[in-house]
C-alpha cells in the first residue's frame, strides 16, 4: 500500500520520494531492505538520503532492489517501501515499456505534455524534448517551464516524448531522461460547471475512534479532455498541506476516468487513526474547472458500537 | 469599497474591499462592474480557502485579484486602464458552494466609481 516503483536509466541521476509523508521536521531513515543496511545522509555518496528523498547520482543498475524510509516523529513511526529499478541504456531508439511513464491525451485546445518526476529534482529551464527519439524543433512545439505545449495539434502528433534535463547538485551536473505517450483525441468534446457526485452536500460520514477513514471527492467537468479541472479537499477551509496534521493526507496525484463518456476526477483522502478532534473538523470537497468551483461539506460523526440483543 | 478614481488610459488603480461580521475563509468573492446603460458583468473572482482566481477575458493579463486573510480585505490591482474599463465596481461575497464569474452573490458593496479618460 504504501509501496512506490520507481526506475530510472544508468548513468542517470534518479530521485526517489519516500511514499510516507510527514511535516520536513520529521527525521526520515532510509535503508537498503535486502541487507537492513543504512543509507548514508553524507552527500559525497553517490548514493545518498536527504530527508524524504533518496538520490542516486548517478545512478547504477546494482542499486536496483527495495528500499525502506522510516518516517519519524516524537509520537510515530511510518514505514514506507520504494521499489527501485535501474535499467542499462538501450543502444537503440526504442523506449521499452518498462521505461514509460503515464500515457497523456491532448486535443486541439489541450496538448500540455507535463515532464514525469521533474519536480523533485533540481533543474533550469530550457527542458529538452525529444519525439521518437528525435528533437523536436519548429514554432508549433514550445517548452514551457516543466512541459511542452504543441500548437494546432495533429493526430501526427501522437507518438513518444522524451524529456532531458539537467540535475544540478552541489555544482556537479547529471542528466535524466524521462519518457511518456501522448495520445490525441480528436473527438468534439464540452466542459459544464463541476457535477460533485460523492460526497453529498452535507453528508455525515461515520467513522471509528483510533480506526483509518477515507473520504473520496469524485467530480466529472464534461467530455473529452479538460483544459483545467482539479479536485482536492480542504479542512476547516485550509489546504491539507497548510493544515499541518500528518495523519491527514491527500493521495498524491488525482486518479482520471471515463464515467459515461464524461472526464471525472477522484481524490482520497486519507485519515490515520482517527481521533476526536477530527469529528470537528468541516471537510471540504472542492471541483473547479474554467467555469467555477464547487463545494461539498462533510462531517465525520462517531459510529455507535451495534447492540447485539437476543 | 475604496480605491475609485479618475485615471488616463494606461494608467493604474487599485481598488480594496473590506470584510466585515464574518469569517474570511470558504467564501467566494469577486469584482463586478457596471457601465452605464449596460448590465452589471463580472470581473474577477476569488475563492478565498485556496487562492483560486477566475477572470473576464476582457481584463485576463490587466487585472489582478488577490486578498489579505489577515485584514479581511479583497484588492483588484487594475494596470494597463482602457476607457471601456470606465464602471462602477462592486465587492460581492458569498458563503454558498459555487464560485465562479457566472453565479449569484450574496452580499454586495456600495460600489466605487472608475473613470479611465483617453
Known amino acids: 500500500k504504501f509501496s512506490k516503483q520507481s526506475w530510472g536509466l544508468e548513468n542517470e541521476a534518479l530521485i526517489v520520494r519516500c511514499p510516507r509523508q510527514g511535516k520536513p521536521s520529521y527525521t526520515v531513515d532510509w535503508y537498503y531492505s535486502q541487507t537492513n543496511k543504512s543509507i548514508p545522509t553524507q552527500e559525497r555518496n553517490r548514493v545518498f538520503a536527504s530527508g524524504q528523498l533518496l538520490k542516486f547520482l548517478p545512478a547504477a543498475v546494482a542499486d536496483s532492489g527495495i528500499y525502506t524510509c522510516i518516517v519519524r516523529s516524537p509520537t510515530f513511526n511510518r514505514t514506507g517501501y520504494a521499489n527501485v529499478t535501474i535499467y542499462k541504456k538501450q543502444s537503440d531508439c526504442n523506449v521499452p515499456d518498462y521505461l514509460m511513464y503515464s500515457t497523456v491525451s491532448g486535443s486541439e485546445k489541450n496538448s500540455k505534455i507535463y515532464c514525469p518526476t521533474i519536480d523533485l529534482y533540481n533543474w533550469t529551464a530550457p527542458l529538452e524534448w525529444f519525439k521518437n527519439c528525435q528533437a523536436l524543433q519548429g514554432s508549433r512545439y514550445r517548452a514551457h517551464k516543466s512541459f511542452l505545449v504543441i500548437d494546432n495539434v495533429m493526430t501526427e502528433d501522437a507518438g513518444d516524448y522524451t524529456c532531458k534535463f539537467i540535475h544540478n547538485e552541489n555544482g556537479a551536473n547529471y542528466s535524466v531522461t524521462a519518457t511518456r505517450s501522448f495520445t490525441v483525441k480528436d473527438e468534439q468534446g464540452f466542459s459544464l460547471f463541476p457535477v460533485i457526485g460523492a460526497p453529498a452536500q452535507n453528508e455525515i460520514k461515520e467513522v471509528e475512534i483510533g480506526k483509518n477513514a477515507n473520504l473520496t471527492c469524485s467530480a466529472c467537468f464534461g467530455k473529452g479532455t479538460q483544459f483545467l479541472a482539479a479536485v482536492l479537499w480542504q479542512l476547516n477551509g485550509t489546504k491539507i498541506t497548510d493544515f499541518g496534521e500528518p495523519r491527514i493526507q491527500q493521495e498524491e496525484g488525482q486518479n482520471q476516468s471515463f464515467s459515461n463518456g464524461l472526464a471525472c476526477l477522484d481524490m482520497v483522502l486519507r485519515i490515520a487513526d482517527v481521533k476526536e478532534e477530527d469529528l470537528l473538523l468541516q471537510y471540504d470537497c472542492l471541483a473547479l474547472n474554467l467555469h467555477g468551483l464547487r463545494r461539498h461539506t462533510v462531517r465525520l460523526s462517531r459510529k455507535n458500537p451495534i447492540d447485539h440483543h437476543s | 469599497e475604496s480605491g475609485g478614481g479618475s485615471v488616463q488610459s494606461g494608467g493604474s488603480l487599485r481598488l480594496s474591499c473590506a470584510a466585515s461580521g464574518y469569517t474570511f475563509r470558504r467564501y467566494c468573492m469577486g469584482w463586478f462592474r457596471q457601465a452605464p446603460g449596460k448590465e452589471r458583468e463580472g470581473v474577477a473572482v476569488l475563492y478565498t480557502g485556496v487562492d483560486i482566481t477566475y477572470y473576464a477575458d476582457s481584463v485576463k493579463g490587466r487585472f489582478t485579484i488577490s486578498q489579505d486573510n489577515a485584514k479581511k480585505t479583497l484588492y483588484l490591482q487594475m494596470n494597463s486602464l482602457k476607457p471601456e474599463d470606465t464602471a462602477l465596481y462592486y465587492c460581492?461575497?458569498?458563503?454558498?458552494?459555487?464560485?465562479?464569474?457566472?453565479?449569484?452573490?450574496?452580499?454586495w458593496g456600495q460600489g466605487t466609481q472608475v473613470t479611465v479618460s483617453s
Open positions: 460581492a461575497a458569498d458563503s454558498g458552494p459555487l464560485c465562479g464569474l457566472g453565479i449569484q452573490f450574496g452580499y
